[in-house]
């Protein structure tokens, strides 16, 4: 009774990659350890059969599937995926294992399925069974985290209603401005959904589960700061919950804090104080000014006013929907080879959006950051100085807005060429758009400057790639030029590059570059 | 490498709560094919399965035990939380926490890993 | 709660025996029974799932047999690291319930 070859089979998840097809590989890419699959013999079936456990995949999401074989000796091996072979290469490793992956890049719905995966070895045959589904994240949202306070404590609550249920945190700074960045030193994470430390600085509080991370800022105006230049401004949609933190901190307990809405005291039961002694024994008190449901009739100025301190004011605006303002007319820009260069996009919303950058049919990161005027800006420096189209999308629970750009990098012709037994053409991809010339070299004209005007046919822009033009020009074959060597030029303001041709009967052509500048 | 560890305090006192913390390795609690149990141990006795819990939060308890019980995950941690209510002296036990895999032809993966386990001891 | 019955509670066996344990189910559970080896001082190790299939890595010389509520695991050939307490669990219905548990001592 022969001894079951141990098999391990594992899913490896990979930060995710530029393409887009399923392979066989021996070497995945670097990733994230393995995750075991639990291989077993399926029960009740007729041969060898092991199956691992289902997977479920994120579209777009890079995976290696992998089975490790203990058995004496070498193996072969072949993959199937819905009638079709694939190529399988098993390796080593250093335990002396064997080794094969399946590497599925930028998973799609096609690329759902049963892999079955057949292995050869010296003592015995045996096929393994890995089941790939596409996520279902129809069914998952991610809102955006709102306070509550908590009954009969002076402590606020976290709530983001969520699925799959997310992982609240509260995300304190104590200092001021840059050092408050997520990664710096000066900021304190805490893992909970009651916080009762409400005196700090900066206060977020941030919602995260498998489709991201959302965070809400405690709107906080502090009395000892300069007030900004533009008045702070917070949009609310009907129903959301308001909270408003005024601050302020005193030699001593002398002072009080109070809340107007348009010159009206707010009512009892829409604010709550706290106060504290701080290190240097001077007194900080603050100031909560709530709404849980707000209505069309709570919008207008909230103004914090203190014994010892000048008042500030906020502007709050209740809108009944969500919002994304900015200018969506397209933007032209041409730059030289090397000048540093970014796009950007100024816009106000609410709720915050969530944004990308798009070049190519390829998504890139967005980043926004909020200026002191209500507005928030988003840049895109990563072009690499390739000319084309970029996108700006944003979106939010309510709108959406897209803005295209063009980008034109400033360089001299680079000229292709080919020929066919009736016409010869080239291309460039030069901008400005360049103009073309063709010349004919003879005996009488060695240096080719005898130019061709017959049979010239150009195209300013005969194909778009990914929004990069593309110019043209074709030479039709006359008697007059057939066996001679012919040049083509393109030239613009930044130079003029060239290719000569020999027309020759059908067969292969050489061509020489030329490159003037 | 799959692994399970399960951390939590060796003495508890009557009436208080026992709450233990299995933290994985190697495989992924968001795999809708993955689940942890929960079973324990009394000192040369049977095991007793107490709790399971899936990727989308389904939970399952022992008949016997379920008003004292609460299953609980997070995926981020790779951890999975038991609390246990009211603890007696009968509740002395080594506690495992163990893996069920499921697969295309059923949930037949019952148990394939545990941890070492942990001896609570329930005295006053 | 289905009650799962194991016998014999031990059994003492020399090395190169056939040992066979017995599990019933108090009612049928079709194929969904487990096999498990406990040493003393370490947790459980499965032997066999869905009633007879090995796991892997195991030794061939355990086996599992049976369907519905008669279940045997077998040791064709007792090795001087089987002598051990095995179990078996059912997870059928809710809650999971676990056999008794056999002994196997050296005679």
């Known amino acids: 009774n022969q001894d079951l070859p141990v098999i391990k089979c594992v899913l490896i998840n990979h930060k995710n990659n530029d393409s887009s097809v399923g392979k066989s590989s021996s070497y995945p890419m670097v990733s994230e350890s393995p995750e075991d699959l639990g291989c077993a013999l399926r029960p009740q079936s007729s041969g060898t059969v092991y199956e691992a456990a289902a997977v479920e995949v994120d579209v777009s999401a890079s995976i290696t599937l992998q089975v490790l074989v203990d058995a004496p000796g070498n193996i072969s091996c072949l993959w199937v995926f819905k009638h079709s072979s694939l190529n399988c290469q098993p390796h080593f490793d250093l335990q002396n294992r064997g080794v094969v992956s399946m590497v599925i890049l930028k998973m799609t719905e096609t690329q759902a399925g049963e892999y079955l995966l057949f292995i050869q070895s010296e003592a015995t045959n045996y096929t393994i069974l890995f089941t790939v589904s596409i996520r279902n994240t129809l069914l998952y949202t991610l809102r955006r985290p709102y306070f509550r306070k908590m009954e009969n404590q002076d402590a606020l609550v976290c709530i983001s209603e969520s699925v799959p249920e997310p992982i609240v945190e509260w995300v304190l700074c104590d200092s001021q401005g840059e050092s408050c960045k997520e990664e710096s030193p000066a900021v304190v994470k805490k893992e909970e959904k009651v916080l009762h430390e409400l005196f700090g600085t900066d206060i977020r509080c941030c919602a995260r589960n498998e489709l991201g991370r959302e965070c809400t800022r405690l709107f906080t105006i502090d009395l000892n700061q300069t007030p900004q230049t533009t008045l702070p401004q917070l949009f609310l949609k009907v129903g959301e919950p308001l909270w408003i933190r005024c601050k302020a901190v005193h030699v001593n307990h002398g002072f009080g804090l109070t809340w107007e809405l348009e010159n009206k005291a707010l009512e009892e039961g829409n604010y709550f104080e706290m106060s504290t002694y701080s290190t240097n024994r001077t007194m900080i008190r603050i100031l909560f000014a709530f709404v849980s449901s707000v209505a069309r009739n709570d919008t207008g100025y909230y103004t914090c006013s203190s014994s010892k301190h000048p008042s500030q004011s906020a502007l709050v605006t209740i809108v009944e929907k969500g919002f994304i303002n900015a200018t969506n007319s397209s933007e032209d820009y041409e730059i030289d080879q090397y000048e540093e260069f970014c796009f950007s996009v100024r816009f106000k919303a609410y709720p915050q959006i969530r944004c990308t950058w798009t070049f190519s049919r390829k998504s890139f990161p967005c980043e926004q950051k909020g200026l002191d005027n209500g507005y928030s800006i988003s840049k895109f420096c990563n072009h690499k100085h390739q000319p084309g189209e970029y996108i700006f999308h944003a979106e939010n629970d309510d709108a959406q807005f897209t803005k295209m750009f063009t980008l034109n990098i400033r360089r001299k012709p680079q000229v292709l060429a080919e020929a066919s037994a009736s016409q010869a053409s080239c291309f460039s991809d030069g901008y400005p758009l360049p103009s073309w010339t063709w010349k004919k070299c003879s005996d009488k004209s060695p240096n080719c400057t005898e130019e061709i005007t017959e049979g010239v046919w150009n195209r300013k822009a005969n194909r778009k790639v990914f929004g990069q033009w593309v110019s043209s020009s074709t030479l039709n074959m006359s008697e007059a030029i057939k066996g001679f060597l012919v040049k083509c030029c393109a030239y613009n303001s930044l130079g003029t590059s060239c290719e000569t041709i020999l027309l020759n009967s059908p067969g292969p052509f050489p061509f020489i570059q030329d490159n003037i500048s | 490498q799959v692994t399970l560890k399960e951390s939590g305090p060796v003495l508890v006192k009557p009436t208080e709560t026992l709450t233990l913390t299995c933290t994985v390795s190697?495989?992924?609690?968001?795999?809708?094919?993955?689940?942890v149990s929960w079973i324990r141990q009394p000192p040369g006795k049977t095991l007793e399965w107490l709790a399971h819990?899936?990727?989308?939060?389904?939970?399952s308890y022992s008949t016997s035990l379920k008003s004292r019980l609460t299953i609980s995950k997070d995926t981020s941690k790779s951890q999975v939380v038991l609390t246990m209510t009211n603890m007696d002296p009968v509740d002395t036990a080594t506690y495992y926490c163990?893996?069920?895999?499921?697969?295309?032809?059923?949930?037949?993966?019952?148990?394939?890993?545990w941890g070492q386990g942990t001896l609570v001891t329930v005295s006053s | 709660d289905i009650q799962m019955t194991q016998s014999p509670s031990s059994v003492s066996a020399s090395v190169g025996d056939r040992v066979t344990i017995t599990c019933r189910a108090s009612?049928?559970?079709?194929?969904?029974l487990a096999w498990y080896q406990q040493k003393p001082g370490k947790a459980p190790k499965r032997l066999i799932y869905a009633a007879s299939s090995l796991q892997s890595g195991v030794p061939s010389r355990f086996s599992g047999s049976g369907s519905g509520t008669e279940f045997t695991l077998t040791i064709s050939s007792l090795q001087p690291e089987d002598f051990a307490t095995y179990y078996c669990?059912?997870?059928?219905?809710?809650?999971?319930?676990f056999g008794g548990g056999t002994k196997v001592e050296i005679k």
């Open positions: 163990a893996r069920i895999v499921g697969y295309g032809s059923g949930w037949y993966g019952y148990f394939d890993y």
């Open positions: 669990l059912q997870h059928n219905f809710y809650p999971l319930t």
């Open positions: 819990i899936f990727s989308n939060d389904e939970k």
């Open positions: 190697g495989f992924s609690l968001r795999n809708a094919r993955m689940a």
């Open positions: 009612q049928d559970i079709r194929y969904d």
